[in-house]
């Protein structure tokens, strides 16, 4: 009904009132909801409402305003410090102490990050998105930079249902159907050898406690593994000889270690250097990622930042020490 | 079977040193880190000193800093604890233990040896 | 540095009770705390770690609860292989400190 100048919609009614006509919605049931729009931000409850703009937001902390899209900080947040003197001794030696293990004190240096003392560096959210790894989703944390809330928005608790079968059958050159999902890894691009590749751009490079001859004969586990916590497919790089890019890596030089073999005396033939473990090149093919999910790493320098997270969480199932995102194409770096 | 055993125990005068050596196996040596623990006689457990075998790094209890020194030799697998100036209070069963966590001193130790016995007395 | 105190220092139980031991810290560890089973002249076992985490090949009657400055360890039916001395231990900061120990003993 029209009501002067004002137009009303579908249901409702004219009501001239002392400020002038107004639509008045008499039975919710009738009128267009005003929740059809999903209005309230950040997981923020609708409610119907009979007038304009016929919904109200019930929001959750801490957002308000009429859709939930206000941030409002909380008064009583202290300002993070960190226990200087004693974070301040044990920061960068390698070992990561969980008292110093937080934002204030760059993870200990980089200790608890894999040598990365921010990786949510490029996250601009308003909340502090490291400290809402928490089993629920949080939009404002929910982009690439923010390293997709750590998976929270989208089910993260799905696991593979037949997790030991697909296991042993991944990335073996053998599509098995049962473990073509998301949450089983898509059975290693066993079944889509058929579709074009999809690179991310960029190479992770990574360092693990683990002799080279011993993590190529684990590749397969590896690779899931740390494809299962990238919601992706990753693979070894080749270099332009065809050769696998895993290299023996000797250990950093660091202060604690060049004390250490001070003390230590060489003994006859004993050898120079020992390997400590290895740098592996890989990168991310995203083919079946971007067919099932909009939550894929165009480039890998969130990736890194996503598995240092995991570090700092000690959710790795791997001896990492160290992960890089390098953009340019490397020949061997050492 | 991730394993540790540890020797070098014995009987020592006060001021005396001794060097205890725990021989690991099982498992990927460096990527783990290492504790000492000692229990006196009839006592409860104490922490000695930690160790992460990659890098070097140390930690220590202050009722032994100073006078005890943890190493590690990766070629051979096998933490040590040198232990100089020693006490009659330094009289325990010395435990090496590792830590669960990589690279983690903020882990739990979840492997232990079978401990040495060391006696300071005169 | 963190104090760790058990109580009780000792009890005495049957085949069969549930026994409850708990552990207090001087300040806050979050969840890292462990608990240790240790028989006589033997060296200590992890039973329980992160607060309430089972270590591998532990039976499910013994389970661990509480975080920041409070946690329990229960033993829902006592069996005799329990009998034996039970640490609490915290590693959330160095020095890593141990409770003074429970006896678990044979009423």
């Known amino acids: 009904s029209s009501c002067g100048q004002v137009k009303c919609r579908k249901g409702e009614q004219c009501v001239h009132t002392a400020s002038g006509p107004r639509c008045f919605c008499p039975s919710p049931r009738d009128c267009e909801s005003g929740c059809a729009s999903s209005p309230c931000q950040h997981g923020g409850s609708c409610h119907p409402q009979r007038q304009p703009p016929y919904y109200s937001c019930q929001c959750a902390p801490p957002f308000s305003g009429s859709r939930c899209e206000l941030y409002t900080a909380p008064p009583s947040t202290p300002p993070a410090t960190c226990l200087s003197q004693y974070c301040a001794d044990k920061a960068r030696d390698g070992v990561c102490d969980e008292a110093c293990n937080s934002h204030a004190c760059q993870w200990d240096g980089g200790d608890c990050s894999l040598t990365m003392e921010n990786p949510w560096a490029n996250c601009s959210s308003p909340l502090p998105c490291w400290d809402y790894i928490n089993n629920q989703c949080d939009e404002l944390c929910n982009t690439v930079e923010c390293l997709f809330d750590n998976f929270e928005c989208q089910g993260n608790s799905k696991t593979c249902k037949y997790d030991k079968y697909c296991a042993d059958h991944f990335k073996d050159n053998h599509c098995d159907q049962g473990c073509n999902s998301e949450e089983c890894g898509w059975d290693g691009l066993d079944c889509a050898a058929d579709q074009p590749e999809n690179l991310a751009e960029g190479t992770l490079v990574i360092v693990v406690l683990m002799p080279p001859e011993q993590l190529l004969q684990d590749a397969r586990s590896f690779l899931r593994a740390l494809g299962t916590l990238l919601h992706t497919n990753l693979r070894i790089k080749r270099d332009s000889q065809g050769e696998l890019m895993v290299y023996p890596y000797y250990g950093e030089k660091s202060a604690a270690m060049k004390k250490q073999r001070m003390t230590r005396r060489s003994l006859p033939g004993e050898q120079e250097q020992e390997v400590a473990g290895s740098k592996v090149f890989l990168e991310i093919d995203n083919r079946q990622c971007v067919q099932d999910s909009d939550h894929c790493f165009k480039n890998t320098d969130a990736a890194a930042a996503l598995l240092a997270s995991h570090a700092i969480q000690g959710t790795l199932s791997y001896p990492l020490v160290s992960v890089v995102s390098e953009s340019l194409t490397p020949e061997r770096t050492q | 079977e991730v394993q540790l055993v540890e020797s070098g125990g014995g009987l020592v005068q006060p001021g005396g040193s001794l060097r205890l050596s725990c021989a690991a196996s099982?498992?990927?040596?460096?990527?783990?880190?290492m504790s000492w623990v000692r229990q006196a006689p009839g006592k409860g457990l104490e922490w000695v000193s930690y160790?992460?075998?990659?890098?070097?790094?140390?930690y220590y209890a202050d009722s032994v800093k100073g006078r005890f020194t943890i190493s590690a030799d990766t070629s051979k697998n096998t933490a040590y604890l040198q232990m100089n100036s020693l006490r009659a209070e330094d009289t325990a069963v010395y435990y090496c233990?590792?830590?669960?966590?990589?690279?983690?001193?903020?882990?739990?130790?979840?492997?232990w040896g079978q401990g040495t016995l060391v006696t300071v007395s005169s | 540095d963190i104090q760790m105190t058990q109580s009780p220092s000792s009890l005495s139980a049957s085949v069969g009770d549930r026994v409850t031991i708990t552990c207090r810290a001087s300040?806050?560890?979050?969840?890292?705390l462990a608990w240790y089973q240790q028989k006589p002249g033997k060296a200590p076992k992890l039973l329980i770690y992160?607060?309430?985490r089972r270590a591998s090949g532990v039976p499910s009657r013994f389970s661990g609860s509480g975080s920041g400055t409070d946690f329990t360890l229960t033993i829902s039916s006592l069996q005799p292989e329990d009998f034996a001395t039970y640490y609490c231990?915290?590693?959330?900061?160095?020095?890593?400190?141990f409770g003074q120990g429970t006896k678990v003993e044979i009423k």
């Open positions: 300040q806050s560890n979050r969840r890292f």
């Open positions: 992160g607060a309430s």
């Open positions: 099982g498992y990927s040596f460096t990527s783990y880190g």
């Open positions: 160790i992460y075998p990659y890098s070097g790094a140390t």
């Open positions: 231990q915290q590693y959330y900061i160095s020095p890593l400190t």
């Open positions: 233990a590792r830590h669960s966590g990589y690279y983690r001193i903020s882990s739990a130790m979840d492997v």
